[in-house]
């Protein structure tokens, strides 16, 4: 799996989409988990409705929501009021029994609001550190991360 980068602005909402084969994953619940670094385990944040037929209903855990379009084959995660600590690696997963298939690996980056002049502290400004070579990553736009790339607009 390549890693797809989604960037959002602090304080705003970020939508992450995970496309999948609706036939292959028919009848399976989905989940959104946070990876503890690239090498660490993936800890469940939120999962779709216990009844697969009701997967279209939005479920929340704190500021994170999940909804599944099972016919169209798109899992959507919404991170509301994005904060610096929301940045990191995540996975969209398809659940079957105690197993989980990875649908997409996601890197969430939180950018500083250029209009917010308060102490930026833990926030990142594009171009402040190592950045993609010859790449333009817009806020809330995703792109795939190639092996060896460090996707810094961020500084950490």
């Amino acid at each position: 799996h390549n890693t797809t980068v989604f960037q959002g602005v602090a304080g705003q909402s970020l939508q992450v989409s995970c496309p999948y084969d609706s036939m292959k994953h028919w009848g399976r619940r989905k989940a959104w988990c946070r990876q503890l670094g690239e090498k660490g385990p993936c800890q469940r944040v939120v999962s779709t409705h216990n009844l697969w037929l009701l997967s279209f209903l939005r479920r929340w855990n704190g500021s994170t929501a999940i909804t599944d379009d099972t016919l169209g084959g798109t899992l959507t995660i919404t991170l509301r009021n994005l904060q610096p600590h929301d940045a990191g690696l995540y996975q969209c997963q398809s659940l079957h029994g105690s197993e989980a298939d990875t649908l997409r690996k996601v890197l969430v980056e939180v950018l500083a609001d250029p209009l917010d002049h308060r102490d930026a502290g833990d926030l990142w400004f594009p171009g402040e550190s190592e950045s993609f070579e010859d790449a333009h990553v817009e806020h809330s736009i995703s792109r795939s991360l190639l092996e060896g790339e460090i996707p810094f607009p961020p500084t950490s």
Epitope: T3, L36, G37, E38, K39, G40, P41, Q43, P84, H85, A87, G88, L89, L107, D122, L145, E147, G148, E149, I150, P151, F152, P154, T155, S156
Partner: antibody, heavy 120, light 112 residues
Framework: QVQLQQSGAEVVKPGASVKMSCKTS????????ITWVKQRPGQGLVWIGD????????NFNERFKTKATLTVDTSSSTAYMHLSSLTSEDSAVYFC?????????????WGQGTLVTVSA | DVVMTQTPLSLPVSLGDQASISCRSS???????????LEWYLRKPGQSPKLLIY???NRFCGVPDRFSGSGSGTDFTLKISRVEAEDLGVYYC?????????FGGGTELEIK
């Protein structure tokens, strides 16, 4: 910018214990693994263990499992290492380090080191 | 534990020469996620170690392109194409794929 500031040098007696700190700044503390590394005078680097502040997950080198205790205080963005039952073998410089980025676990950011001297 | 064996122990070079350091692991160091977490660090006297190479061959930001990493399986190499005075110090390979993570014994790069 990312910074890791370690506590000052310690001189302790054999059998005693010591707790050193690694105060971080410039990034979301909960999001990155903190690693501890030992270097004795004239010797190589030894990986002690690491801790993930956001969940308290830890990995350890078995050699240090009864020697070192790793903890964090998220309110002050500080990692701690407690060393117990000190002997001359524990005289060393201890470093804390942080991984470079979510997609690069290499230790890119290091503290300046804490020198521990065990002496009667 | 994975044992990382570095050779040579000491490497005398003239400035401008190429230097090559070898690192051999006692078993393959491919993580369960498919990545090989082989890194190279330089420690100069009185300084903290500095990350040079990660995931076998990726240069960390700010590291000059005269440094290159290569290898696979159990055999890895760090090459410095033209040694400069600021490159002197002790080089360590490191595997971060299998706990406990382990460093090589170090190779001292010194002036001939």
């Amino acid at each position: 910018q990312v910074q890791l500031q370690q506590s000052g040098a310690e001189v302790v007696k054999p059998g005693a214990s010591v707790k050193m700190s690694c105060k971080t700044s410039g990034y979301p503390f909960s999001n990155f693994w903190i690693t501890w590394v030992k270097q004795r005078p004239g010797q190589g680097l030894v990986w002690i263990g690491d801790i993930y502040p956001g969940s308290d997950n830890r990995n350890f080198n078995e050699r240090f499992k009864t020697k070192a205790t790793l903890t964090v205080d998220t309110s002050s963005s500080t990692a701690y290492m407690h060393l117990s039952s000190l002997t001359s073998e524990d005289s060393a410089v201890y470093f804390c380090a942080r991984e470079a980025y979510y997609t690069n676990p290499g230790f890119a950011y290091w503290g300046q080191g804490t020198l521990v001297t065990v002496s009667a | 534990d994975v044992v990382m064996t570095q050779t040579p122990l000491s490497l005398p070079v003239s400035l401008g020469d190429q230097a090559s350091i070898s690192c051999r692991s006692s078993q393959t160091i491919i993580h369960s996620n498919g990545n090989t977490y082989l890194e190279w660090y330089l420690r100069k006297p009185g300084q903290s170690p500095k990350l040079l190479i990660y995931k076998v061959s990726n240069r960390f930001c700010g590291v000059p392109d005269r440094f290159s990493g290569s290898g696979s399986g159990t055999d890895f190499t760090l090459k410095i194409s033209r040694v400069e005075a600021e490159d002197l110090g002790v080089y360590y390979c490191f595997q971060g794929s299998h706990v406990p993570y382990t460093f090589g014994g170090g190779t001292e790069l010194e002036i001939k």
